[in-house]
Interface confidence: low
């Protein structure tokens, strides 16, 4: 029996299309595939950012694959050919690995890159990113922000910078159509007449950095002699009710503080007949059904009732 062998793919390379971290991995079929014309050859691709402990593994019949990477670090990838067992009348045959790497040659020292980058997607509508200039950079240094997500033809530059002392320290983004639930890539680079400035790359998903508006229309309703229902409404905007978690702070007679986290726009509170004053505030956050993370809203305006015996009144704002 002659041992069946297969060559690795040819021309394996990582191509940067200018999408700030979304790279193309591509290759050509191996040499000498004539013996396996009836066979569908597959490829096992492994790739990672340099420094990462784990490889991502993909099996594909295609000659290309695309994914996002952290361009602050280098990228390494390897690929080999797989002949399925149906082609070899036995076990799967694998070629040796073809390997490649990619990295962006860094300019400037790390301290020159932007510091404390912070992005917030306000009410799932308006994206704002802010940063601080690098350490020790001169006032002639200016930073520029570029962004890309799947759906844009090419990376776009910020057109509405937030400035301080003539320097760009943030960006107000335009309306970003169909931009959530996919990776959003940002590069902040810089220029200075005195020294090169290090670029910084960031990747996140917009639904994970949402800061909602606070809840509105807080009300009280007497349910029974010892229960009061607190109610509020979701804030105006595109976020559906099913996406909210709420945190409530309730104060009775300036002494008792109750905090609770709930999924609905109501909370039933046990009270005593002696309660003279009741105040509460609510804040909202996007929940785990709609995002992996989020930012608490500001607290709502405080809603209080005082002066009359709570047991004798239905309380509405």
């Amino acid at each position: 029996d002659t041992e069946i062998k297969v060559n690795p793919p040819q021309d394996f390379e990582i191509v940067d299309p200018g999408y700030l971290g979304y790279l193309y991995l591509q290759w050509q079929p191996p040499l000498s595939l004539d013996h396996f014309k009836e066979c569908t050859v597959e490829y096992e691709l492994k790739y990672r950012n340099i420094g990462s402990e784990t490889w991502k593994t993909i099996i594909t019949k295609n000659l290309h694959y695309k994914d996002g990477f952290d361009l602050n670090k280098g990228i390494e990838a390897k690929i080999h050919t797989l002949l399925p067992w149906q082609c070899t009348n036995g076990s799967e045959v694998q070629s040796s690995w073809a390997e490649t790497t990619y990295w962006i040659s860094p300019q400037g020292i790390p301290e020159t890159k932007v510091q404390d980058m912070d992005c917030v997607y306000y009410n799932w509508q308006y994206l704002l990113c802010s940063w601080k200039p690098g350490i020790g950079v001169l006032l002639d240094t200016n930073y520029n922000l570029f962004y890309w997500y799947e759906g844009l033809d090419h990376a776009l530059q910020c057109v509405d910078y937030i400035k301080a002392d003539g320097q760009n320290i943030g960006c107000r983004f335009p309306y970003l159509e169909a931009s959530d639930y996919k990776d959003f890539y940002i590069c902040v680079n810089g220029s200075s007449e005195n020294k090169p400035i290090r670029s910084s790359y960031f990747t996140f998903q917009l639904q994970n950095i949402v800061k909602p508006l606070p809840p509105v229309y807080l009300t009280f309703t007497r349910e029974s002699s010892c229960e009061i229902k607190l109610k509020w409404s979701i804030p105006l905007g595109p976020i559906p009710a099913r996406c909210f978690d709420y945190e409530i702070e309730i104060r009775e007679d300036d002494t008792t503080l109750v905090t609770a986290t709930v999924e609905n726009e109501t909370y039933t509170l046990k009270t005593t007949n002696e309660t003279r004053q009741l105040c509460f505030v609510v804040r909202s956050k996007v929940n785990i059904y709609c995002s992996d993370d989020g930012i608490w809203s500001e607290w709502s305006d405080k809603q209080c009732w005082e002066g009359e015996d709570l047991s004798k009144k239905t309380l509405l704002r």
Partner: nanobody, 128 residues
């Protein structure tokens, strides 16, 4: 409205094979991902595998790598999960799900949060 229908579940002996099908209808986009999930009795639902309509790439959870294989039917709206060398611990209700908002599969560990349409599930029992 997107509808997903799974089929192909059943009783199989350890070491045996099954092919599950997921047929999707009611969607307009060509760009989407379809994932297979499973939920064993008394356990949380876990991601098994994912395929992208755009790139035909597949991603698998570690426990099924080399045993399960995802593929697309000639009609683009059908996805097959070929399961071989089945083990008793593969016993679960298997669900397929679609996310029409994504074009690439996420990490398996976070996959359950990314899907907006779900099927009703099909039961796979591996037992001798």
């Amino acid at each position: 409205e997107v509808q997903l229908v799974e089929s192909g579940g059943g009783l199989v002996q350890p070491g045996g094979s099954l092919r599950l099908s997921c047929e999707a209808s009611g969607f307009a986009s060509d760009d989407y991902i379809i994932g297979w999930f499973r939920q064993a009795p008394g356990k949380e639902r876990e991601g098994v595998s994912c395929i992208s309509s755009k790139y035909a790439n597949t991603v698998y959870t570690d426990s099924v790598k080399g045993r399960f294989r995802l593929s697309r039917g000639t009609a683009k709206n059908t996805v097959y999960l070929q399961m071989s060398a089945l083990k008793p611990e593969d016993t679960a209700v298997y669900y397929c799900a679609m996310d029409s908002r994504r074009v690439t599969c996420p990490e398996i560990s976070t996959m359950h949060r990314n899907f907006d349409s779900w099927g009703q599930g099909t039961l796979v029992t591996v037992s001798s």
